[in-house]
């Protein structure tokens, strides 16, 4: 029985050229997190493996920084970075939990963070 929930930063916006932190947090379960995959529309950005640590995809080495924690920092944002991002928590014994974040990269200097929300 999967009892956990993933809390994410929800819908967020950021300025072109700036940085943003993508964060997910798994709660309400004692399952062990074995690996977290960060994806952007089916493309793998990075992996944080419990035994092997952080690994960044060749597509994103120059623009992605690990952390904080199990989160991911996107740098040098472009308008093309607008879209859905997913944190996929692989856990034992529960299985897989997925959180969704929507990032909008704005041309203007007005970029407000959205509210947090939960995905069961």
């Amino acid at each position: 029985m999967m009892t956990g929930t993933i809390e994410t930063t929800g819908n967020i916006s950021a300025e072109k050229g700036g940085s943003i932190i993508l964060q997910c947090h798994l709660s309400s379960t004692t399952a062990q997190v074995t690996q977290v995959n960060w994806e952007q529309q089916d493309q793998l950005l990075a992996i944080c493996n419990a035994d092997l640590g952080w690994h960044i995809s060749p597509s994103f080495k120059d623009r992605v920084a690990p952390g904080p924690g199990l989160g991911l920092t996107l740098q040098s944002l472009t308008v093309n970075d607008t879209g859905e991002y997913f944190c996929i928590y692989h856990t034992y014994p529960d299985g897989t939990y997925t959180g969704r974040i929507f990032l909008e990269v704005l041309e203007s200097s007005v970029a407000e963070h959205g509210a947090r929300f939960q995905i069961p």
Epitope: Q43, L44, I56, T96
Partner: antibody, heavy 126, light 113 residues
Framework: QVQLQQSGPGLVKPSQTLSLTCAIS??????????WNWIRQSPSRGLEWLGR?????????DYAVSVKSRITINPDTSKNQFSLQLNSMTPEDTAVYYC????????????????WGQGTLVTVSS | DIVMTQSPDSLAVSLGERATINCKSS????????????LAWYQQKPGQPPELLIY???TRESGVPDRFSGSGSGTDFTLTISSLQAEDVAVYYC?????????FGQGTKLEIK
């Protein structure tokens, strides 16, 4: 000892689809420490990486932008192999096509090519 | 794309002499996060696929003779064959696996003088 055995046609007509298969022995296509690539070589383009498939708790693909609109690389876990499909072939796609294992050592998402298939000369001609 | 440029295009060296092949990348292939250099060297003989010689710029692949060595940092790399043997006649390629698309140098043809 890892071995990669390629199969598929050597002649393809223009506008048709190239289908090649790479059978793996001595490793698993679902390995968490490898990725499975297709690379081609021609006198005009040299060695050109086309794309890869790999499993890291789920399946992923990465493709070269130059062929992204017409390439598909699929794993077949039941046969322990992976395939290349390249659509809309033109004479410029004439090349020797290789499959290769990318060993993920120290970095589980990138590595060098430590095992290669024997190569398949593919000619695109009517 | 990262462009890999090798020099020279061809090289003739006497048996037993040192052979040096250079490779330059258009941008750094050193990843600061893990301090690894994402560069490999391959040897290709006629009618055969490339064979891995060196990875992480300087680590020799298992079974590769110790006369082959790799060095370099950032954007400039060298493959050295300390004492050329007849079986070393081949085309040599460098390759970066830092970012997509993975790219290769144009090759250096090594012959015996």
């Amino acid at each position: 000892q890892v071995q990669l055995q390629q199969s598929g046609p050597g002649l393809v007509k223009p506008s048709q689809t190239l289908s090649l298969t790479c059978a793996i022995s001595g490793d698993s296509v679902s390995s968490n420490s490898a990725a499975w690539n297709w690379i081609r070589q021609s006198p005009s383009r040299g060695l050109e990486w086309l794309g890869r498939t790999y499993f890291r708790s789920k399946w992923y693909n990465d493709y070269a932008v130059s062929v992204k609109s017409r390439i598909t690389i699929n794993p077949d876990t039941s046969k322990n192999q992976f395939s290349l499909q390249l659509n809309s072939m033109t004479p410029e796609d004439t090349a020797v096509y290789y499959c290769a294992r990318e060993r993920a050592l120290y970095d589980i998402l990138a590595g060098s090519f430590d095992y290669w298939g024997q190569g398949t000369l593919v000619t695109v001609s009517s | 794309d990262i462009v890999m440029t090798q020099s020279p295009d061809s090289l003739a060296v006497s048996l037993g002499e040192r052979a040096t092949i250079n490779c330059k990348s258009s941008q750094s292939v050193l990843f600061g996060f893990n301090n690894k250099i994402y560069l490999a060297w391959y040897q290709q003989k006629p009618g055969q696929p490339p064979e891995l010689l060196i990875y992480w710029a300087s680590t020799r692949e298992s079974g590769v003779p110790d006369r082959f060595s790799g060095s370099g940092s950032g954007t400039d790399f060298t493959l050295t064959i300390s004492s050329l043997q007849a079986e070393d006649v081949a085309v040599y390629y460098c390759q970066q696996y830092y970012s997509f698309p993975y790219t290769f140098g144009q090759g250096t043809k090594l012959e015996i003088k």
